[in-house]
């Protein structure tokens, strides 16, 4: 792992999931242990990410379970790598007018996408929904990550770094709690509410308006409960 890890100083409290969403479904970007990147219909331990903001709108995205950086090759294929290459593993982040985020390679210009087609980002373009992302706070109990949390006074510093090379377990001052709207969900179909017949709000329009509360890739914005 690089000495100057973009993840240094991160904490488990900052775990987020990037997901694409239409009125009917959502896919969470996951980085598997073998470096394969795909989408899952739900949060998984492999879709838990750390996103580090850098200067000029650049971000570095890492899967905490795979311990791999999200990177892109010259063909626009995304993959997870243990090694951080600034040219391939940094992405330009932009928020579109609809409140969704897009990430593209400054080196190769392709969009990060869960779709199979590779498309270059052009200013003002309207990318397909599988290339537009929202961020959502982690809801998976930390115990499921099955990473031993260092016990006080029982392990040396060397042991700690061996178990936690990306330093995601290091205690630090907690991040500002996310606003309540971050985890706001619409009623489920089981609820006896006026929205129960339309739990995703599809009658009121396709894409969810996510302008409110947007704070960049490390913040989270209100989301609808996609199935």
């Amino acid at each position: 792992y690089p000495n100057a890890s973009p993840l240094l100083g991160s904490s488990w409290g900052g775990l987020i999931h990037l997901y694409t969403a239409t009125a009917r479904n959502s896919y969470h970007l996951q980085i598997h242990k073998n470096g394969h990147v795909d989408g899952a219909p739900h949060q998984t331990i492999y879709s838990a990410l750390m996103i580090r903001s850098e200067d000029a709108g650049f971000v570095v995205i890492t899967g905490v379970m795979s311990r791999r950086y999200l990177c892109m090759d010259f063909r626009g294929n995304i993959f997870g790598s243990h090694y951080f290459d600034p040219e391939n593993c940094r992405f330009q982040h932009q928020t579109l007018e609809n409140g969704y985020d897009v990430y593209h390679s400054p080196q190769y210009h392709f969009l990060v996408s869960l779709g199979r087609a590779k498309r270059a980002f052009l200013p003002g373009m309207n990318p397909p929904p599988y290339s537009q992302f929202l961020s959502r706070r982690n809801e998976i109990p930390l115990i499921h990550f099955n990473t031993p949390i260092p016990r006080r006074h029982t392990q040396s510093a060397e042991d700690d770094s061996e178990r936690d090379p990306l330093n995601v377990l290091k205690p630090r001052a907690r991040m500002t709690p996310a606003p309540a709207s971050c985890s706001q969900e619409l009623p489920s179909a089981e609820d006896n509410s006026p929205m129960a017949s339309d739990p995703l709000g599809v009658v009121r329009g396709g894409r969810v308006n996510t302008h409110a509360g947007g704070t960049g890739p490390e913040g989270c914005r209100p989301f609808a409960k996609f199935i």
């Epitope: 694409t20 239409t22 009125a23 009917r24 479904n25 896919y27 795909d38 989408g39 899952a40 219909p41 739900h42 869960l114 779709g115 199979r116 087609a117 498309r119 373009m125 309207n126 990318p127 397909p128 929904p129 599988y130 489920s188 179909a189 599809v202 396709g206 894409r207 199935i227």
Partner: antibody
């Protein structure tokens, strides 16, 4: 290899219900949404709804709200679609189809449901 | 909901002909459009995804183009096995299908 195998043809009377099954194999069942699409004789394809295989959450086309129920059994990698209050215009071939983010890549062979008095 | 219209609704062509089918969306859907081929008594088969990407195993005589609201499926040289019905489908907000275009033998 990926396969979606559906239950056999059904003949139902108006007002009855029908439940069609779709058994998935050859992939991780919980990694892909499943859709139901129907096609009346000589007509086009009509999207009915979608089910999240892990949570069981569903979302249906407005036309079918209140009449269609989609469920799944993760232990057998099977999804089900039940259509109630059947009428003659529900006579159709019903398909399940796997979602891969940007398309439906695999489809079941179809189940013919005939509604006739 | 976004509506899709296809034209023509049917066409007659001969083997070797170049065939073009259009699909128009009622509002912009970026490149989130798919084309399927369906033969009688069979399930639809995926041909094109993301408006212009050829699905693995599909012959290169099939191609797709377009973005926004106007899309085209082209068969460069019609083969006997291509006589079928073709459907477009949008993936932008829901999963609406176009009404289909039937390609039969002239």
């Amino acid at each position: 290899q990926v396969q979606l195998v559906q239950s056999g043809a059904e003949v139902k009377k108006p007002g009855a219900s029908v439940k069609v099954s779709c058994k998935a194999s050859g992939y991780t069942f919980t990694n892909h949404y499943m859709h139901w699409v129907r096609q009346a004789p000589g007509q086009g394809l009509e999207w009915m709804g979608i089910i999240n295989p892990i949570s069981g959450s569903t979302s249906n086309a407005q036309k079918f709200q209140g009449r269609v129920t989609m469920t799944r059994d993760t232990s057998t990698s099977t999804v089900y679609m039940e259509l109630s209050s059947l009428r003659s215009e529900d006579t159709a071939v019903y398909y399940c189809a796997r979602d891969i983010v940007d398309a439906f890549d695999f489809w079941g062979q179809g189940t013919m449901v005939t509604v006739s008095s | 909901a976004i509506q899709l219209t296809q034209s023509p609704s049917s066409l007659s062509a001969s083997v070797g002909d170049r065939v073009t089918i259009t699909c128009r969306a009622s509002q912009g859907i970026s490149s989130a459009l798919v084309w399927y081929q369906q033969k009688p008594g069979k399930a639809p088969k995926l041909l094109i995804y993301d408006a212009s990407s050829l699905e693995s195993g599909v012959p290169s005589r099939f191609s797709g183009s377009g973005s926004g609201t106007d899309f085209t499926l082209t068969i460069s040289s019609l083969q006997p096995e291509d006589f079928a019905t073709y459907y477009c489908q949008q993936f932008n907000d829901e999963f609406t299908f176009g009404p289909g275009t039937k390609v039969d033998i002239k």
